[in-house]
Amino acid sequence: MAVTACQGLGFVVSLIGIAGIIAATCMDQWSTQDLYNNPVTAVFNYQGLWRSCVRESSGFTECRGYFTLLGLPAMLQAVRALMIVGIVLGAIGLLVSIFALKCIRIGSMEDSAKANMTLTSGIMFIVSGLCAIAGVSVFANMLVTNFWMSTANMYTGMGGMVQTVQTRYTFGAALFVGWVAGGLTLIGGVMMCIACRGLAPEETNYKAVSYHASGHSVAYKPGGFKASTGFGSNTKNKKIYDGGARTEDEVQSYPSKHDYV
């Protein structure tokens, strides 16, 4: 029962996490204009992974996509890649984990297969969460670097345009969504790996019980027939899967001199 709960909770947490990663990737507010020096600007700038936006005091919001691919900073491309890899792995993990859920019965799938799939999906969720956390952290590092580097007349913005007044950018809402979502996906993955250990059936040794019928000397050993209901314990010897998931080395981010924001 505890295993089913752990697996189910892991799935739900990962599902929320991956939804959050998708939301963060699509959000426009990865970096927002720092209003410390000018809290009453009539023009508010913010940028995402795919486009930059300007919200005017009039209520009008104008967004422009980054229609260039080669002209974008390598770090931004790396963040995009990390987030997309995280989403893809997470989506595959969700698909696998649906079939691995103990409460869902698919044909005559054995517990060993479910345990294997649970572990696979768990590892996928862990890597997915790490990708999201790494992507958001790389972007945050880029923002911090550029925040202190930003001076008047420097080349800034996605297209490398010259600006004549200092515009600094700070952390946007998407970064916090990404960090939380990545963490949830990671936690969900760990829970799936823990559930995997409980799913893998251990070797069950049954003691033979002899029933002596009058006039017969036949010993009946239970366990000789497979349970047809699908709920009984399977007494076949199964390989016990180790739930300790190996994760890839953490992506180390170095301060970049890319004038992104």
Partner: antibody, heavy 120, light 113 residues
């Protein structure tokens, strides 16, 4: 046709209060950011206050902050300017103006104005 | 606050002749996010409220004759009238639309010679 009609102006003593109204018609009032702009007797234009469409954000000229309050009633299509602790330097022709949606924050429509004279 | 400085304060022009008004801001009105300049030009005719002529430093408001042209970048802006007509008489104001308070220039009075 877009129309902005101001009312509530008049003669008031220093330290007194007055409430200006601006009745809007011919456009979806709640969508637009609205402003009050005044023109001094020397013919200088001075922005006074701005309120965004939903009414959530307001901006004021430093010299009127704490004394003037801009508000709006989207159901009645009306903009207000509550003026307290009036001073002689507040004497001006007060215009109600609409901030154009795609006009880069420029004021695309103005009312005819209402005159306020602060004098003892 | 951003200070808007207009010149000249008075501009006598012969009908049919060109006219040029300058406006300088103490801070840049250029926004790097969308590569736009947040400056507007208004004309106030006697006994009337100001009327929007140009926004975004160079975009003509609908209904404004094409003899009016706005130009400039950052801190220096110009309003040009290719051929002045009698109906163009009035006071021209430039306005900062970038940062609150939304300051106006002192105005340039265009008169017919």
């Amino acid at each position: 046709e877009v129309m902005l009609v101001e009312s509530g102006g008049g003669l008031v003593q220093p330290g007194g209060s007055l409430r200006l109204s601006c009745a809007a018609s011919g456009f979806t009032f709640s969508t637009y950011t609205m402003s009050w702009v005044r023109q001094t007797p020397e013919k200088r234009l001075e922005w006074v206050a701005t309120i965004v469409g939903g009414g959530g954000y307001t901006y004021y000229l430093d010299s009127v902050k704490g004394r003037f309050t801009i508000s709006r009633d989207n159901a009645k299509n009306t903009l207000y300017l509550q003026m307290n602790s009036l001073r002689a330097e507040d004497t001006a022709l007060y215009y109600c103006a609409r901030m154009g949606l795609t006009q880069r924050n420029a004021l695309d429509y103005w009312g005819q104005g209402t005159l306020i004279t602060v004098s003892s | 606050d951003i200070v808007m400085t207009q010149s000249p304060l008075s501009l006598p022009v012969t009908p049919g002749e060109p006219a040029s008004i300058s406006c300088k801001s103490s801070q840049s009105l250029f926004n790097s996010g969308n590569q736009k300049n947040y400056l507007a030009w208004y004309l106030q005719k006697p006994g009337q409220p100001p009327k929007l002529l140009i926004y975004g430093a160079s975009t003509r408001e609908s209904g404004v004759p094409d003899r009016f042209t706005g130009s400039g970048f950052g801190t220096d802006f110009t309003l040009k009238i290719s051929r002045v007509e009698a109906e163009d008489v009035g006071v021209y104001y430039c306005q900062n639309d970038h940062t609150y308070p939304l300051t106006f220039g002192a105005g340039t009075k265009l008169e017919i010679k």
